[in-house]
C-alpha cells in the first residue's frame, strides 16, 4: 500500500500532464514534450556495454503503478523515478544506479516523487 493517503489503485488525473521526453518520445510528442494521463518518469540503466543511459518520458496511467515500482531485475542495473506534481516535473528527477552487489530483497520501493520530494517505501 502507498503512504500519504494514496489509494492503491491509480486514479485518473482530471487533466493531461506534460513531461520532458528523451530517448523515449512517442509519435504524438512535440519539441521533446509528451502528454499523459499518468506519470512523468526519468530512468537510468546500463546499456550492453555498461554505460549509464538516462531516459525520460511519459507513462500512461494503465500499468504505470507497476512500472514506477523499482523492482530489481536480476543482472540489470536500473532505477526509475516517477512524478505528477507539475508539468515537466521529471526534469528534476535524478535517479541513481543501484550498487553493483546483488540485492537480496524482491520488492523494491515505489519511486514516486511528490511535493515533499521523498520516496514512498513499503
Amino acid at each position: 500500500k502507498k503512504e500519504d493517503g494514496e489509494s492503491t489503485a491509480p486514479t485518473a488525473r482530471p487533466k493531461v500532464l506534460r513531461c520532458k521526453c528523451h530517448h523515449h518520445c512517442p509519435e504524438d510528442s512535440v519539441n521533446n514534450i509528451c502528454s499523459t494521463d499518468g506519470y512523468c518518469f526519468t530512468m537510468i540503466e546500463e546499456d550492453d556495454s555498461g554505460t549509464p543511459v538516462v531516459t525520460s518520458g511519459c507513462l500512461g496511467l494503465e500499468g504505470s503503478d507497476f512500472q514506477c515500482r523499482d523492482t530489481p531485475i536480476p543482472h540489470q542495473r536500473r532505477s526509475i523515478e516517477c512524478c505528477t506534481e507539475r508539468n515537466e516535473c521529471n526534469k528534476d528527477l535524478h535517479p541513481t544506479l543501484p550498487p553493483l552487489k546483488d540485492r537480496d530483497f524482491v520488492d523494491g520501493p515505489i519511486h514516486h516523487k511528490h511535493h515533499h520530494h521523498h520516496h514512498h517505501h513499503h
Epitope: 482530471p14 487533466k15 493531461v16 506534460r18 512517442p26 509519435e27 504524438d28 510528442s29 512535440v30 514534450i33 509528451c34 502528454s35 499523459t36 494521463d37 499518468g38 511519459c58 500512461g60 496511467l61 494503465e62 507539475r86 508539468n87 515537466e88
Partner: antibody, heavy 116, light 112 residues
Amino acid sequence: QVQLQQPGAEVVKPGASVKLSCKASGYTFTNYWMQWVKQRPGQGLEWIGEIDPSDRYTMYNQKFKGKATLIVDTSSSTAYMQLSSLTSEDSAVYFCARFGYYVDYWGQGTTLTVSS
Amino acid sequence: DVVMTQTPLSLPVSLGDQASISCRSSQSLVHSTGNTYLHWYLQKPGQSPNLLIYKVSNRFSGVPDRFSGSGSGTDFTLKISRVEAEDLGVYFCSQSTHVPFTFGSGTKLEIK
C-alpha cells in the same frame, strides 16, 4: 455549475495590444487547463494555446507564438490572453475553454474588432 | 499539423431523418496512452460550441441518446438518429491527440 465569463466585445486600434479576460467559476480553477480558440467567419476554429493554472505552464500553436501570451491570476480564477501588434487579421471571436483531455466548457466568446 | 476533413460541408435533412457526418484525420488519433482524443461539438448561431461526444463515442452529460459517435484511427462518424429542430447548427470534430490541436471545418445541418 461551470461558467467561463468573457466580455462581449472589445474595439482596439491597429498596432495596439489588448488583454482579453476569462473568469472561471463552479470548479477548482487549478484542476484544468485553460485553452484559447480563435474563430473568424468562414475560417473555422483555430487553437491558439493553453495554460495550466496550477504551474502556469503554457503550450502554444506555433502560428500564434509572438502574437498571443497566456497568463492566469489564480487568486481571482481568471485567465487572460494578451494579443499584441494587432491588425485586421486579428479581428475575430476569441473563446476561452476548459480543458482536461478535451474541451468540455466554453466561454461565450469576446468579439475583437481591430479598426482605426 | 493534423488536418481534420469533415464531410459534407452542408447537410440538408428533414426533421425525424437520420443524419451522418464524417470526419477524417490526416494521421492516426490514437494517443501513446491508447486513448483516442476525437471529439464532436455543436455550435448554434451566435453561441459558443457545446460538447456532444468525447473520445470518439462517449456522450457528454445531458446529451440526448439520439447522438452517437463511432470510428477509430483516422476515420470517425457522428450520427443523429432522429433529427430535431434543436439539433440544427454547425457540427465540428476536434482532435486533442496532437499539438497543435485542430478542428474540422464544420458541417452545417439545415432543414431541407
